[in-house]
């Protein structure tokens, strides 16, 4: 029978024979036919012999051909196929036989090694995976192993092995994504090759043109579009363009990957058009397709017979910008092309030469904080060389300033300062600004609060009036002018109120306002009755046994807490001492006092005696101290005895008792052993050490005595008063 | 941007614990292996342990082991180190690591997290 | 001690060429593939070279690397400044399962 399909000398799907042994192989057939063999077989090899067909079998009607392989190496494994030559008039199906010849090698187990670096196998999840880790004999144990430390194991439906291919993986998933090696033991020795799996992507992650859209050219340049289509490592891409000139294929176009991304693969496509004319102008549109996904990406060409300028302002001619602002941006509207020259002038002198600040954006020249250096006349100069084009057009820079009050920003002091009651002040605020400011005078009275527990007070947000020189709130004016100074060489305005009679405590505000904003300056109107705010006094230095009187005044919207305080040093150090039984602090007008009566005083008493009160404004105790010192008593003396004295009836007499002594001694007079008072004609004078008597009388006449007595004793003197001449009682009736 | 992101490091007492997190972006972090190396002050790198991509198979060092465990959550891209019964030699910067898939080697690091154990 | 054992210095002249040895055994070096790391002051490791001899993007190919048996070596041609890091080499360990480093090359880059 005639043999449909080429007859092979060996039998069976497959055939084992060991290295070092010759493969002999011959095939029989109908017709002429030709070998196949495995790759890893070189038809040069000097090992392989194929004899051509020749006539054979019955009646030589039958061809013959004859493979003959010495020294069978294992890579030499693989299929061996003997197939009819396709003829004209053959119609069949590929008439071939084929044996799967295994070239065993203990020493070689699998076909192909990959152990320096593995081999890249490409993947796509969801469809077959081959790790093609062929062996050379049948009965090799293969596993196959991911790094680090998973095996996958053959199930016979996802996972199954066979021995000619190598692991096959129904339907691949991230599992199998890896570094993947196959092993085989085969005499105790271990055999590792490597695969590497890359999972196949159509991740595009972005499609870009280079030089942005639009892009300008003038007629005969040459046009240069690179698109830039990034994607995962993992990802191939097709990349076209459309074009107006596409059908006349005006354009050449250039592709490259650009690998040097750790984690992207970058592509790129330069279409290149040189001499463009007018039918070059139009959309571009660079397409990037990779399996299912596709992206594109437009740019839009013009193409211009000659260059051209246009200039106009964006804003009006005259702009306002404010002083302080980070940034300000004098922009003009330009059309040109090819893209001109630009110099901004400041006042007829180059911006950028004149400061740092200046900074050309396109055509907006940018003015980095604004000050009012930066007002004055902009100009742009446009100029396109090669065309003899050149244009420009001025802007004026307004740069207004928010009011600004001199007084403010010198270091104001900590506490506000006192104004003595009656007094004439000066208040002055200087102001800057552009517009200049309008200044106005406020006042804000001050509440007063009667209760124990609050002092009075002075507050920026109560309600205010505005002063005009004929105001009576608050304190009389005297007057309310403004004038002109240069200051620094800026213009500023002064503005004075002065204050005619200081006598009610409130808040003057100076108030300057323009366009931009407002700013005020609050002068606390403090009005004192007390020197400095803050005054002590000792009635008198007292003696032992006297009492201590005290006061201390402070000013009552500068200081409270006020309190009476002994200091006493021990040890080097000065320690406070509080004083019991103090009386409550009494509130006037301006003022608070607080008075320090100590009865009795012994000599201890004696020491720097300090009023302390709190400064509300800083929170500072302050402390005025005034030394005591008692002084030790003494027993009265006299200064001069009293003398007999001879006086004349009607005329006048005094005599003096002055006495010495610690505390001062009191003196009482007697008359014959009798108290004298005080009555008509009889005078005592001061602190009783004068006795005067007017229109003496016989009656008057008799022994008179001074007693000066204190805590130490008594000490007195006597003198014998003679009244001379008779009393003619009808003359004087 | 391929970012490792380590937290949880601090002082704590020996025999406490602590556990550390490593958050993974920009890359496919359920697909790789991830690893905690550490390196005590002046010294070198030593690995402390490592976990497969599904998160079924775990090695880790002799030097930490039944002390240490190492795990993941796939769905919140973060690898853990739960570290018990602390000493004073576990005390180092602590980094995780991973690979990207093509050198399936540490490819990408964290900045790490300091760990101190001391009284 | 580490498993793989490295010089802990060397160092070179600026453009000279400096190999750094590491060596290992068959459960580890032999049978795996060695990668290089590149520590800088301060910072994290940095993969170098991975499969015995591989430079990631973005290394400059003055380093390459080689593996003989159960020895690795990496070569820095024409020695850089910035060359002047720490460097480790690693692999996988069969046996412990696990990574393996070794001690640390430090290289100071003279002059």
């Known amino acids: 029978s005639k043999l449909k399909v080429p007859e092979l000398s060996l039998k069976g799907t497959q055939h084992v024979m060991q290295a070092g042994q010759t493969l002999f192989l011959k095939c029989r057939g109908e017709a002429a036919h030709s070998w196949s063999l495995p790759t890893t077989v070189s038809q040069e090899d000097k090992r392989l012999s194929i004899t051509p067909p020749s006539a054979c079998g019955r009646d030589n009607r039958q061809f013959c051909s004859t493979l003959t392989l010495d020294t069978a190496q294992a890579n030499h494994t693989g299929l061996y196929t003997c197939r009819y030559l396709p003829t004209s008039t053959s119609k069949k199906k590929k008439a071939e036989s084929s044996i799967y010849i295994f070239v065993s090698d203990a020493g070689s187990p699998f076909i192909e090694m990959h152990t320096d670096i593995p081999k890249l196998v490409h993947m796509t999840e969801g469809r077959q995976l081959i790790i093609p880790c062929r062996v050379t004999s049948p009965n090799v144990t293969v596993t196959l192993k991911k790094f680090p430390f998973d095996t996958l194991t053959p199930d016979g439906q996802r996972i199954t092995w066979d021995s000619r291919r190598g692991f096959i993986i129904a339907n691949a998933t991230y599992k199998e994504i890896g570094l993947l090696n196959c092993e085989a033991t085969v005499n105790g020795h271990l055999y590792q090759t490597n695969y590497l799996t890359h999972r196949q992507t159509n991740t595009i992650l972005d499609v870009q043109i280079r030089p942005p859209s639009p892009v300008r050219l003038l007629h005969g340049q040459t046009l240069v579009l690179n698109c830039t289509a990034t994607t995962e490592l993992n990802t191939r891409v097709q990349m076209s363009w459309n074009y107006p000139g596409k059908a006349t294929k005006r354009a050449s176009i250039r592709q490259r990957i650009d690998r040097s991304h750790s984690h992207n693969n970058v592509f790129h496509s330069v279409l290149k058009i040189n001499n463009v004319e007018s039918r070059d102008k139009g959309l571009y549109t660079c397409r990037v397709k990779s399996g299912s996904s596709f992206q594109s990406f437009n740019t839009s060409v013009h193409v211009y017979e000659k260059g051209f300028i246009s200039v106009k302002h964006r804003k009006q001619p005259v702009q306002e910008t404010t002083a302080g602002r980070r940034s300000y941006r004098l922009s003009m509207k330009v059309k040109a092309f090819p893209s001109p020259e630009i110099v901004w002038l400041k006042d007829g002198s180059p911006a950028t030469l004149k400061s740092a600040r200046y900074l050309v954006h396109g055509y907006s020249l940018i003015i980095k904080d604004v000050t009012t250096e930066d007002a004055g006349d902009y100009t742009i100069l446009l100029g396109i060389k090669q065309s003899r084009l050149f244009k420009n057009l001025t802007a004026t820079l307004i740069v207004n300033v928010k009011p600004q009050i001199y007084e403010k920003s010198v270091s104001s002091l900590p506490s506000p300062p006192l104004y003595p009651l009656g007094s004439r002040q000066v208040l002055t605020c200087t102001v800057y600004g552009i517009p200049r400011p309008t200044i106005t005078w406020l006042w804000h009275p001050c509440h007063h609060n009667h209760s124990k527990e609050r002092y009075d007070f002075c507050t920026e947000n109560e309600e205010s009036f505005i002063l005009d020189p004929s105001s009576n709130l608050g304190n009389r004016i005297e007057s309310i002018s403004q004038r002109m100074t240069v200051i620094e060489g800026t213009n500023k305005t002064v503005s004075t109120l002065v204050v005619a009679d200081s006598q009610t405590p409130g808040i003057y505000s100076c108030r300057a306002f323009n366009k931009i904003g407002t700013v005020e300056r609050n002068i606390k109107f403090y009005v004192t009755d007390v020197p400095n705010g803050f005054h002590v006094s000792l009635e008198k230095m007292p003696a032992e046994g006297e009492d201590l009187k005290l006061s201390c005044v402070v000013n009552k919207f500068l200081y409270r807490d006020i309190t009476w305080i002994l200091l006493r040093t021990v040890n080097n150090r000065t320690m406070h001492h509080s004083i019991s039984k103090q009386k409550m602090a009494t509130t006037q007008d301006y003022s608070i006092t607080l008075n320090l009566v100590i009865k009795n005083v012994s000599l201890e008493d004696s020491g720097t005696y300090a009023c302390r009160a709190r400064n509300i404004y800083t929170g500072e105790d302050i402390l005025r101290k005034t030394e005591v010192l008692v002084r030790d008593s003494e027993a009265p003396h006299l200064l001069q005895n009293l003398s007999d004295y001879e006086v004349s009836i009607s005329g006048s007499t005094t005599l003096d008792c002055q006495a010495r002594g610690v505390p001062a001694p009191q003196i009482t007079w007697f008359k014959n052993n009798h108290k004298i008072q005080q009555e008509p004609g009889i005078i005592l004078g001061p602190g009783n050490s004068t006795l005067f008597i007017e229109r003496v009388t016989e009656e008057d006449e008799g022994v008179y005595r001074c007693r000066a007595t204190n805590q130490k004793g008594a000490v007195e003197s006597a003198a014998y008063l003679t009244v001379q001449g008779t009393s003619d009682k009808s003359n004087l009736e | 941007e391929v970012q490792l992101l380590e937290s949880g490091g601090g002082l704590v007492q020996p025999g406490g614990s602590l556990r550390l997190s490593c958050e993974a972006s920009?890359?496919?972090?359920?697909?790789?292996?991830m690893n905690w190396v550490r390196q005590a002050p002046g010294k070198g790198l030593e690995w402390v342990a490592t976990?497969?991509?599904?998160?079924?198979?775990?090695s880790h060092a002799p030097a930490v082991k039944g002390r240490f465990t190492i795990s993941r959550d796939n769905s919140k891209n973060t690898a853990y180190v739960q570290m018990n019964s602390l000493r004073a030699e576990d005390s180092a910067v602590y980094y995780c690591?991973?690979?990207?898939?093509?050198?399936?080697?540490?490819?990408?690091w964290g900045r790490g997290t300091t760990v101190t154990v001391s009284s | 001690q580490s498993v793989l054992t490295q010089p802990p210095s060397a160092s070179g002249t600026p453009g000279q060429r400096v190999t750094i040895s590491c060596s290992g055994s068959?459960?580890?070096?032999?049978?795996?593939?060695v990668y290089w790391y590149q520590q800088l002051p301060g910072t994290a490791p940095k993969l170098l070279i991975y499969?015995?001899?591989q430079r990631p993007s973005g290394v400059p190919d003055r380093f390459s690397g080689s593996k003989s048996g159960t020895s690795a070596s990496l070569a820095i041609s024409g020695l850089q400044s910035e060359d002047e890091a720490d460097y480790y080499c690693?692999?996988?360990?069969?046996?412990?399962?696990?990574?393996?480093f070794g001690g640390g090359t430090k290289l100071t880059v003279l002059g």
């Open positions: 690591s991973s690979t990207t898939g093509t050198t399936h080697g540490m490819d990408v």
């Open positions: 920009g890359f496919d972090f359920s697909t790789y292996a």
């Open positions: 976990i497969n991509s599904e998160g079924t198979i775990t």
């Open positions: 068959s459960s580890n070096i032999q049978n795996n593939y």
């Open positions: 499969f015995n001899s």
């Open positions: 690693g692999t996988w360990d069969d046996s412990l399962n696990g990574w393996v």
